[in-house]
């Protein structure tokens, strides 16, 4: 149901893509967009599972949490939320499962009070690197945000790009160093095979990273050294082997550092022997008694935590001389 | 060394305008988000305006809006509330003041010293 | 918009006392508020961000605690310069909202 309302604020723009994404007229005081439902009270407007096209332009300018999941938007373009008079309390847009493919630079400019966006569940083959930024500059003006939403937000393999798409993900968070507020990221089921080395290095404010149910095998050249404030890390149900000594040092570094390391494909050979001897004096590891063994195959279902030296060998490697073919 | 420095104060009667200025230096201008608040006498602060560093977007307080118009010359380092159809409860100092780059949260991080507008007959 | 409400309006203490004053917002902020100073006839000063940061050349007296909606400004041991209006600002929204402010007297 719609309720009058009355604007904080007013806006005004010279910004030229503002001509097309701003409404020629204020919305009326008691207006709610169609096929949507608003609380002027609860400072929501939800337009949930109405397959929408485009985001609505009579959007009320009291809204703080935009609810836009479900529908068909497919493109958010420049200044998509930028609005006379301007959502500039709006801190939380959810714009999951809407079916979009494309994120464009300065997509969510002029919404100085962002705090939360979700873009999870969305097949994104072309996010721009300036989609959170706004600008090309080296170095741009901070961004708002503190929690970024990117769960399942990789397109099926014949939709991505020419190029990496953790890469293209990982511009996106870089970019001009907006996101240096950023509290919380999520990242989970996007089939990642690495993390690019200088993404956590740039985001210095993390508490909370889910990197669950991906692909990633190694964390070998990943550094957590910068991330003094990370409480929680997510690396549940990945292709991780084992964690050498470097990452178990830096993780035990961390003051407040919770890691969640179930559903792995531990393996349990000489390699494993530190981390094994860390996890039993650590206190970081979230259920590491969970924890078991995947290969060798005579090992499969072992707990780690109850391993000792002597069951964690490697097949010897042959001198040249003594190898058959 | 971060200045601010208001000026454009003054009496003038009911209904009619004012345009204060706001001179900045010791920072780089064009990067910085840019404020107008207000303090009655013997009262509290009210926010009244903010611009964009890039003046793309302006925001006022119900207030005030319809009435005043904040702007920038970003070549000048200037800083403008024009102010029509102004009313007795407008009577003021008027600060200008600077958002600090730190958006977590958003502060005000220097102040000019004020100007005093004062709407009487 | 988000209420600000400070705690006492005004206060009487002693050079040397502890002091504390409280500011509540009438929703969770996190931690994104901020405290300011103003003496009589001046501008008002920044002291504390982010509820418990120092600002820049404030002396340690100073310190800031709270997040969500209970905010804490205290002031260890109050010196003759300390005596000046304080004011809370939420800073999660671009727009500020003050405080009606606490105003500290000497007894």
């Known amino acids: 149901s719609s309720s009058p309302t009355s604007s904080a604020s007013s806006f005004s723009s010279s910004a030229p893509f503002l001509a097309s994404a701003v409404s020629a007229q204020p919305p009326l005081p008691d207006q709610c967009p169609a096929l949507c439902e608003c609380s002027e009270a609860a400072r929501t407007v939800k337009c949930v599972n109405r397959n929408l096209t485009e985001v609505p332009t009579d959007l009320p300018a009291y809204v703080r949490n935009l609810f836009l999941t479900g529908n068909q938007l497919a493109v958010l373009p420049a200044g998509a939320f930028a609005r006379r008079p301007p959502l500039a309390e709006l801190a939380a847009l959810n714009l999951s499962g809407s079916r979009l493919d494309e994120v464009r630079a300065g997509a969510f400019e002029h919404l100085p009070s962002l705090r939360q966006l979700d873009l999870s569940h969305n097949p994104l083959a072309d996010l721009s690197p300036f989609a959170f930024s706004g600008s090309n500059a080296s170095v741009s003006a901070p961004s708002p945000l503190v929690e970024l939403i990117l769960n399942h937000i990789v397109p099926p393999e014949d939709e991505r790009q020419n190029r990496s798409f953790e890469g293209m993900v990982v511009a996106a968070l870089l970019a001009g160093r907006a996101l240096q507020g950023l509290r919380r990221l999520e990242l989970a089921s996007n089939h990642f095979l690495y993390l690019p080395r200088d993404v956590l290095a740039q985001l210095p404010s993390l508490r909370h990273l889910d990197l669950s149910n991906n692909s990633l095998v190694s964390l070998t050249y990943v550094s957590f050294r910068n991330l003094t404030h990370l409480e929680s890390l997510h690396l549940e149900d990945n292709a991780l082997k084992v964690l050498h000594n470097g990452t178990l040092a830096e993780l035990q570094g961390l003051p407040h550092i919770r890691v969640f390391l179930d559903n792995n494909p531990w393996v349990c050979d000489c390699h494993m022997a530190d981390m094994v001897t860390w996890l039993k004096e650590t206190e970081v590891v979230q259920g590491k008694d969970r924890l078991t063994c995947a290969y060798p195959e005579k090992m499969r279902n072992r707990v780690l935590l109850e391993l000792n030296s002597a069951d964690l060998d490697c097949d010897p490697i042959l001198p040249p001389s003594l190898q058959t073919s | 060394e971060v200045q601010l420095l208001e000026s454009g104060g003054g009496l003038v009667q009911p209904g009619g305008s004012l345009r204060l200025s706001c001179a900045a230096s010791?920072?780089?201008?064009?990067?910085?988000?840019m404020s107008w608040v207000r303090q009655a006498p013997g009262k509290g602060l009210e926010w009244v305006s903010s611009?964009?560093?890039?003046?793309?977007?302006?925001y006022y307080a119900d207030s005030v809006k319809g009435r005043f118009t904040i702007s920038r010359d970003n070549s000048k380092n200037t800083l403008y509330l024009q102010m029509n159809s102004l009313r007795a409860e407008d009577t003021a100092v008027y600060y200008c003041?600077?958002?600090?780059?730190?958006?977590?949260?958003?502060?005000?991080?220097?102040w000019g010293q004020g100007t005093l507008v004062t709407v009487s007959s | 918009d988000i209420q600000m409400t400070q705690s006492p309006s005004s206060l009487s203490a002693s050079v040397g006392d502890r002091v504390t004053i409280t500011c509540r917002a009438s929703q969770s902020i996190s931690s994104y508020l901020n405290w300011y100073q103003q003496k009589p006839g001046k501008a008002p000063k920044l002291l504390i961000y982010a509820a418990s940061s120092l600002q820049s050349g404030v002396p340690s007296r100073f310190s800031g605690s709270g997040s969500g909606t209970d905010f804490t400004l205290t002031i260890s041991s109050l010196q003759p310069e300390d005596f000046a209006t304080y004011y809370c600002q939420q800073g999660y929204y671009y727009l500020p909202t003050f405080g009606q402010g606490t105003k500290l007297e000497i007894k």
């Open positions: 010791g920072f780089t201008f064009s990067g910085s988000s």
């Open positions: 003041a600077r958002y600090g780059r730190n958006v977590h949260p958003y502060n005000l991080d220097y």
């Open positions: 611009i964009y560093y890039s003046g793309s977007g302006t």
